[in-house]
């Protein structure tokens, strides 16, 4: 799902109130709800019909450091009998997210909010069919 | 997937460096690849085995105020012949993700990170069948 | 190991009631699910209904819904299936299953029989 734009204006102080200098905010030290947790069953993405596979990008400037993207391992699904079936797809579940930027020069330090792309997994599709003519 | 414990020296200024004052720190305006779209097929929830519904949810005092939940139709998945097999399991795939939450007194406005647990979608899963017996 | 413990099953006459209680226990686990399939003489086995535990979702058979109800108790991890306006085609071996870790582990029971007849 999709972050809709700031149109900044969720970072400006309301009109009545003075302009922030330099144009930068405040950033409160500490996460909110840091210790919550996902409760996601351990190798779901081994028994989905749509399994997938996980690779984990690692930057020591961002925050959280470790992102981890999803690949879906099969063009179709696997069925039943454990083979993989074509006519069903394989498809990336995708989910845009923040990180935190660090950018220090020296001692100055400042943190910039960054759009992410995740794939945090796959699922299974029934394609629309569409019967067209050859010319 | 899950975030990992910032134990705040992310936030941190190098050892050598006076701390931050008043335990917050600069956040820069703006969002960096703030144009970045998610691809995702139209309609995936619906054509998925295993589909789902969103339900909304929004605060003004949250960056992103709209934040979207997935919720598994479901209990089994959908097989080719568009009938709930309760042989397999429609389950939930969860992201962890940063919002921004906005804390204003007055003219005085600061922000902090907040950890959102998301459900993104639904995949189907065969589960590992295991005998036991009554008593 | 998640043990089942069930309760119920038996002979009712035609139009009848009956009620089945299952129950999962030992060790720390999860629930995603708990519900019923049935196997008649002959034929395959075939669902008949089950509850989700995150948010109590009923879900039914066509071929039961209006007679059967399916109701938890959260608290002793267990569910009871009760059966109204039973059919003889109603007979069957009952199964009693729990799904859970998320709905990737199914474990299953013995049956028990239950025979509608006059």
């Known amino acids: 799902r999709k972050i809709p734009k700031v149109g900044h204006t969720f970072f400006q102080k309301p009109e009545s109130c003075p302009p922030v200098p330099g144009g930068s905010m405040k950033l409160d030290i500490g996460i909110i709800n840091e210790n919550q947790r996902v409760s996601m069953s351990r190798n779901i993405e081994s028994r989905s019909t749509s399994p997938w596979n996980y690779t984990v990008t690692w930057d020591p400037n961002r925050y959280p450091s470790e992102v981890v993207q999803a690949q879906c391992r099969n063009l179709g699904c696997i069925n039943a009998q454990g083979k993989e079936d074509i006519s069903m797809n394989s498809v990336p579940i995708q989910q845009e997210t923040l990180v935190v930027r660090r950018k220090h020069q020296g001692c100055s330090v400042s943190f910039q909010l960054e759009k992410v792309l995740v794939t945090v997994g796959c699922t299974c599709v029934t394609p629309v069919i569409h019967h067209v003519q050859h010319h | 997937r899950k975030i990992p414990k910032v134990g705040h020296t992310f936030f941190q200024k190098p050892e050598s460096c006076p701390p931050v004052p008043g335990g917050s720190m600069k956040l820069d305006i703006g969002i960096i690849n703030e144009n970045q779209r998610v691809s995702m097929s139209r309609n995936i929830e619906s054509r998925s085995t295993s589909p789902w519904n969103y339900t909304v949810t929004w605060d003004p005092n949250r960056y992103p105020s709209e934040v979207v939940q997935a919720q598994c139709r479901n209990l089994g998945c959908i097989n080719a012949q568009g009938k709930e097999d309760i042989s397999m399991n429609s389950v939930p795939i969860q992201q962890e993700t940063l919002v921004v939450r906005r804390k204003h007194q007055g003219c005085s406005v600061s922000f902090q990170l907040e950890k959102v647990l998301v459900t993104v979608g639904c995949t189907c899963v065969t589960p590992v069948i295991h005998h036991v017996q009554h008593h | 190991e998640v043990q089942l413990v069930k309760s119920g099953g038996g002979l009712v006459q035609p139009g009848g009631s009956l009620r089945l209680s299952c129950a999962a226990s030992?060790?720390?686990?999860?629930?995603?699910?708990m519900g019923w399939f049935r196997e008649a003489p002959g034929k395959e086995r075939e669902f008949v209904a089950a509850?989700?535990?995150?948010?109590?979702?009923?879900y039914y058979a066509d071929s039961v819904k209006g007679r059967f109800t399916i109701s938890r108790d959260n608290a002793k991890n267990a569910v009871h299936l009760q059966s109204n306006s039973l059919k003889s085609e109603d007979t069957a071996v009952y199964y009693c299953?729990?799904?859970?870790?998320?709905?990737?582990?199914?474990?299953w029971g013995q049956g028990t029989q239950v025979t509608v007849s006059s």
């Open positions: 509850i989700r535990w995150s948010d109590g979702s009923s």
């Open positions: 030992g060790g720390t686990f999860s629930l995603f699910a």
């Open positions: 299953y729990a799904d859970v870790q998320g709905g990737l582990h199914r474990y």
